[in-house]
Structure formats: C-alpha cells, structure tokens
C-alpha cells in the first residue's frame, strides 16, 4: 500500500525532518508550510491550522522560502555614483553597483555599499595594476626609458621614442623629442591603454588628492548572518 501523504500541519516521525518547503514549528510541534519568495507569514501555524502567508508590501522582499513575520526592507536607492543592476521586487533586493570609472570600496552581501573613483596616475606614473570592480588602480613611477604624460586610470608607461638625434631627452613624464622628422623607431601614435574593467568604461579627469603612488586601500568587512528563519533550512 502506498504511504499516506501528510498534509501540513503534521507531526513528523521521530527522528525525521520536515519536507522541502516546510519547517518544524517548535510551539505547535508540527511540520508547517513555509511561505514562498515574495511572501511572509501572516498567521503562524497551530496544531490544526497551517501557516497563512501574505504578499510583501512595496519596497520589501523575501528571496527564499521562509516563515518570517515581516519581509525584509529593500536597500535604499542607488547613489549618484552607482547604477541599479537589479530592481527591488517582492522577491529580490535592489542591487547597486559602481558606475564606470568607479570601484567598490565597501561591498555588501550583494552589490556595493560605497563606491570610490578610480585613482588616476598623474604624469610620470603609469598603471601598474588596473582597477577592477572591487579594487583601485595601482600606479607606479615610470622606469627610465619610459614615460606617461597623461592623468589617467588606464594608461601605462610607454617607451620613449628612439631618435637618430635627440633634441630634448625624454623623462618620466615626457617623450623624447627628436631633431629629425623621422625617428628610427617610435611607438604607434596615441596612448597605450590597458584593458578596462567592466565598471570603468569612461574616463574622468579629476585628480586624486593622495599621491599617485599611494597603495590601494582594501576594506574587509565580515558578512552579516542571513536573516533569521528566512531559508534557514534551505528550500
């Protein structure tokens, strides 16, 4: 004979756990239904009555099957240095990421809490390590024989052009100037660019207040615990 399918609420067999999308209610001592994503518990189960769920209100959400009495509040609107990559819905939180030319200096569980502009290497310095979504540009002084004459978060140090006759020797921030109109060897015209990270598609010209050689600052924050009851026993 096939086993009877138990309908919630039901008392679990000793030593067994509740089924998928159910939770064990310690007060009722029963397996009760969870609420689906986008909902929350409006009335908890009793020994003979199952959980009653209700939709999350505007600007609140639940992402997992849950039995929380209140939906979670969506994060605040994205700031001017961010773009909203995921909208707040009843089933998901708003996600803000840094706009091009910025990186995430302080992350949160999803998205970014605090964006900062990518460092720009001033003339005489080039990009040693490009910026990413979560790390700043690292600048380095141009080595002898190389230069950078731009203030940029993407330009690397380029070799000086090699002249038959040097009019003005190159330095870290200026290319060599040749007397003859055709140097024996030169770089292709235009600045050499590093590949840009996803979040750095446009350039900004404001100089950084700190020295260009300042090391990139990392922020490490512990992740907070997941919300209670929400999905604490999985789907």
């Amino acid at each position: 004979l096939p086993a009877q399918v138990a309908f919630t609420p039901y008392a679990p067999e000793p030593g067994s756990t509740c089924r998928l999308r159910e939770y064990y209610d310690q007060t009722a001592q029963m397996c009760c239904s969870k609420c689906s994503p986008g909902q929350h518990a409006k009335v908890f189960c009793t020994k003979t009555s199952d959980t009653v769920c209700d939709s999350c209100e505007d600007s609140t959400y639940t992402q997992l099957w849950n039995w929380v009495p209140e939906c979670l509040s969506c994060g605040s609107r994205c700031s001017s240095d961010q773009v909203e990559t995921q909208a707040c819905t009843r089933e998901q939180n708003r996600i803000c990421t840094c706009r091009p030319g910025w990186y995430c200096a302080l992350s949160k569980q999803e998205g970014c809490r605090l964006c900062a502009p990518l460092r720009k290497c001033r003339p005489g310095f080039g990009v040693a390590r490009p910026g990413t979504e979560t790390s700043d540009v690292v600048c380095k002084p141009c080595a002898p024989g190389t230069f950078s004459n731009t203030t940029s978060s993407t330009d690397i140090c380029r070799p000086h052009q090699i002249c038959n006759v040097v009019a003005i020797p190159g330095n870290a921030s200026m290319d060599a100037v040749c007397t003859s109109t055709s140097p024996t060897r030169s770089m292709a015209p235009g600045a050499v660019h590093l590949p840009q990270p996803v979040s750095t598609r446009s350039q900004h010209t404001q100089p950084t207040p700190e020295p260009s050689t300042a090391p990139s600052t990392s922020f490490l924050l512990p992740m907070g615990p997941s919300p209670p009851a929400e999905g604490s026993t999985g789907d």
């Epitope: 310690q26 007060t27 409006k42 908890f44 009793t46």
Partner: antibody, heavy 119, light 106 residues
Framework: QVTLKESGPGILQPSQTLSLTCSFS??????????VGWIRQPSGKGLEWLTH???????YYNPALKSRLTISRDTSENLVFLKIANVDTADTATYYC???????????WGQGTTLTVSS | DIQMTQSPSSLSASLGGKVTITCKTS??????IAWYQHKPGKGPRLLIH???TLQPGIPSRFSGSGSGRDYSFSISDLEPEDIATYYC????????FGGGTKLEIK
C-alpha cells in the same frame, strides 16, 4: 477598541479549584488568527505565561503547569475561562488575560485580577 | 523550555538619558522577541515585537536589536512616564518572559 477584563474569586483556600473568567470586546474569537491567553504575576515577581486558546480551539499550556490547567471559551459571549486545580499559596498572584494575534504576540491585556490563596 | 535571562534587574537613570536592557536566551530564538512596559495596576503594554519593530503609536525613543541568543532594548531621551518595569518575551518556542527590569529616574 479592544478591551479585556478578568474576574475571579479574590481569595481561595489551598486545594480548591480556581475559576477565572476573561470577558473581552472589540474582537471575536471566531476571527481567524486570534486567541486569548492567561499570564500571571506572583507578588514581587515576574510574568509567567500559563495557557492560551486559539480561534480554532487549539490550546497551548505551560508544560510545568499543564496537569492543573484547563482553558475553554464561549465564543458567542466573548468569554474565555481558566481553571487551575488544587491551588496552593504559590498560586497567589495577579492573573491577566490577553489577546494573542496570529504572529503569537500578546498585543492587548486586561488590568488583572488578584488571587490570594490562604488557609 | 527556553530560559530567559534579563539584566539588570533594576536601574536608575537621569531624565533625558539613555538606558539599555538585555535579554539572553538559552537557545537561538530567530528574533522572535517582544518587549513590554508594565506599570502598577495596569496590564503590560506591547512596545516592540520581532526584535526591533515598533508597535503603532510607540515613540521612536524605544528601540530593540539583536539576533541569535542575545537581544537588547533601549530607551533614549528618558521621560518621567518611562518609569515602569520592562519585560522581554520570547515566542519562538511556546512563551517565556524575562525576569523584568525596574526602571527608576534619578
């Protein structure tokens, strides 16, 4: 406006049975998700949850007192009753009834009725 | 049964000041904690539920926080009418109150 009011004998002798009544208005025990419970406070001590009854007649009891407690209701008259058998001086307390809503919080309380158990 | 340890049992503070009361539970209660204000001759009054949600009509001077087994309740900008005994209540596994905190004003 939700109100609850407790009534009881005031004084009992040890071994007698305590009968308390909670009369309420502003809500109905026929309303899905609502219940009425009893909490007591011995003089100079903290609050102690005793029992409550839900709209669907499900009952919950404090395990330490379960054998002595009986809760019942009259939905048509908006009454909830509590009986405590075999009272002792330790049962001397102020007894409160309170409404409990579907998320299990006691949100409205009566002013309490005092019981003294003395021989 | 879940045990509730509320502290301090009494405290005295100045008008306009701030006080904090804590409740520790014997097991994780998933934020299912409420806070009540109790004045003599009256029934307790629900101030906060689900750790930090203020009941309608309760001033924002009252606040709650916590998770797991550790919870706290604060009153800022103390006023004379705040003189009362305050209780925590866990409702994750049946119901159990803390021992109470009697608040006095200096």
């Amino acid at each position: 406006q939700v109100t609850l009011k407790e009534s009881g004998p005031g004084i009992l002798q040890p071994s007698q049975t305590l009968s308390l009544t909670c009369s309420f208005s502003g809500f109905s025990l026929n309303t899905f998700g609502l219940g009425v419970g009893w909490i007591r406070q011995p003089s100079g001590k903290g609050l102690e949850w005793l029992t409550h009854i839900w709209w669907n007649d499900d009952k919950y009891y404090n395990p330490a007192l379960k054998s002595r407690l009986t809760i019942s209701r009259d939905t048509s008259e908006n009454l909830v009753f509590l009986k405590i058998a075999n009272v002792d001086t330790a049962d001397t307390a102020t007894y409160y009834c309170a409404r409990i809503e579907g998320l299990r919080r006691f949100d409205y309380w009566g002013q309490g009725t005092t019981l003294t158990v003395s021989s | 049964d879940i045990q509730m340890t509320q502290s301090p049992s009494s405290l005295s503070a100045s008008l306009g000041g701030k006080v904090t009361i804590t409740c520790k539970t014997s097991q994780d209660i998933n934020k299912f904690i409420a806070w009540y204000q109790h004045k003599p001759g009256k029934g307790p009054r629900l101030l906060i539920h689900y750790t930090s949600t203020l009941q309608p009509g309760i001033p924002s001077r009252f606040s709650g926080s916590g998770s797991g087994r550790d919870y706290s309740f604060s009153i800022s900008d103390l006023e004379p009418e705040d003189i009362a005994t305050y209780y925590c209540l866990q409702y994750a596994n049946l119901w159990a109150f803390g021992g109470g905190t009697k608040l006095e004003i200096k």
